[in-house]
Amino acid sequence: ENSFEMQKGDQNPQIAAHVISEASSKTTSVLQWAEKGYYTMSNNLVTLENGKQLTVKRQGLYYIYAQVTFCSNREASSQAPFIASLCLKSPGRFERILLRAANTHSSAKPCGQQSIHLGGVFELQPGASVFVNVTDPSQVSHGTGFTSFGLLKL
Amino acid sequence: ENSFEMQKGDQNPQIAAHVISEASSKTTSVLQWAEKGYYTMSNNLVTLENGKQLTVKRQGLYYIYAQVTFCSNREASSQAPFIASLCLKSPGRFERILLRAANTHSSAKPCGQQSIHLGGVFELQPGASVFVNVTDPSQVSHGTGFTSFGLLKL
Amino acid sequence: ENSFEMQKGDQNPQIAAHVISEASSKTTSVLQWAEKGYYTMSNNLVTLENGKQLTVKRQGLYYIYAQVTFCSNREASSQAPFIASLCLKSPGRFERILLRAANTHSSAKPCGQQSIHLGGVFELQPGASVFVNVTDPSQVSHGTGFTSFGLLKL
């Protein structure tokens, strides 16, 4: 991991993360992630905290992304679509939505899979955390590669 | 192309690629790509090999992405969803899935178009190749801009 | 904003933008954007012009992305799918399509939401502009985070 840090010199290390979805028995709408499989954690300037948020130590512009694959059925779900939200919590600030995507449930049975991708450039403050929220975590697909979350510092 | 290479100095050239889908008569599930249209190939530190894989010469963190548009119909397709996979082959290692997305087939006739986007940050070793695999290449849309594949080195 | 500009030194400032969708009464298929909400505009080397295009001052490789969420119904829409296009206008050149995504309309009533994500690496010339075109702007969702557009210079 040091190799990443040194490429740009001590003053401007590479900062990037890519974490993998983890099924959770918790009844929260915030998705859980793990450093497993083919994950990336460049150095300690970005950390995965409580398995649910990526927290950065340095201010700057970051490209932040998330991908969520889910399986749902129109009849078995609420009328509202499946929504995935990329959210930000900065120190001393309220949580806020950065990006959202919505997909109407499939009519396929027992459920129809769909994938959502979110991504954008945002300024983060030191100690800022980003996380992913969904309308129904029980519908999320956790098979290899289906659901992931990451960022890179510009 | 040299202009890209020199921007960061000889030690840290810009490395990026964006290639365009190509219809293929081959019976492989691996998508074919070409340096055509508005493509990007920054320098020889990333190459398109055999029209199917992007291969990098330098170790490091890369943001890798793919977009696949396809047209399918529920009745004419297998029950399994359309799946696009971003895969990695490193020297001396097995191929592995980095990212996947799945979309249930449409009920529209003759077929319904849908688009998938995949993207994430991964460490690549020298000589590593990335490629895109789909469940049914005959369903992929090759019209201008619909299906593409690329990467950039952080 | 100067902090972004100075991170890489005067010769190589950070260049990035992220703008937010704006509902428009215009009958154009080109989406409208605004510097509002949690937007990014790193410096004057990228600008939002006429509320519809991101224009860059420096030549180079850029990762350009757009996300469009829309709500449509198969019966109320034309048979053609909803298509979002990322387009380029370079000085002295014709407009061209860089990326496209297509989604067949939903059968949900009154309409079914779907999200499209586009992204890729392209070389832009000084004065080049990128913009987003859709088949039916009236179907685009402008709720917080649903529809956005941005770029970053490598």
Epitope: T144 | K89, R93, F94, E95, F131 | -
Partner: nanobody, 129 residues
């Protein structure tokens, strides 16, 4: 499950060539990484070459890559090993091995025996001087 049957072994003079075959049956071999290993008398089994399931990318033992070529014919569900300029030290039983594409075991390396799920019975190659 996949069954693997090797053939093509035999006696050959030093400097000669042989082509080994491995016929795969059962579930579609398109979904399998394939490899050749060999075991000389009184020695441990060693990696020869591997070919990936999707790209058809090849990996070789450094000491053999100039003389041996691995290939596969997916239509015939057959794996091949072309061996040129054979030497007496190439005398061994040659084994075909397979691993499911979707398998994520503790080993990610193509040259480790433990990476593979299925093995053939082997075919004997004898190189006389």
């Amino acid at each position: 499950e996949v069954q693997l049957v090797e053939s093509g072994g035999g006696l050959v003079q030093a400097g000669g060539s042989l082509r080994l075959s491995c016929a795969a049956s059962g579930r579609t071999p398109l979904n399998y990484h394939m490899a050749w290993f060999r075991q000389a008398p009184g020695k441990e089994r060693e990696f020869v070459a591997a070919i990936s399931s999707l790209l058809g990318s090849t990996d070789y033992s450094d000491s053999l890559k100039d003389r041996f070529t691995i290939s596969r014919d997916n239509a015939k569900a057959t794996l091949y090993l072309r061996m040129n300029n054979l030497k007496p030290e190439d005398t061994a039983v040659y084994y075909c091995a397979a691993r499911e594409t979707t398998h994520y075991s503790t080993s990610d390396r193509v040259n480790e025996m433990r990476s593979y799920d299925y093995w053939g019975q082997g075919t004997l190659v004898t190189v006389s001087s």
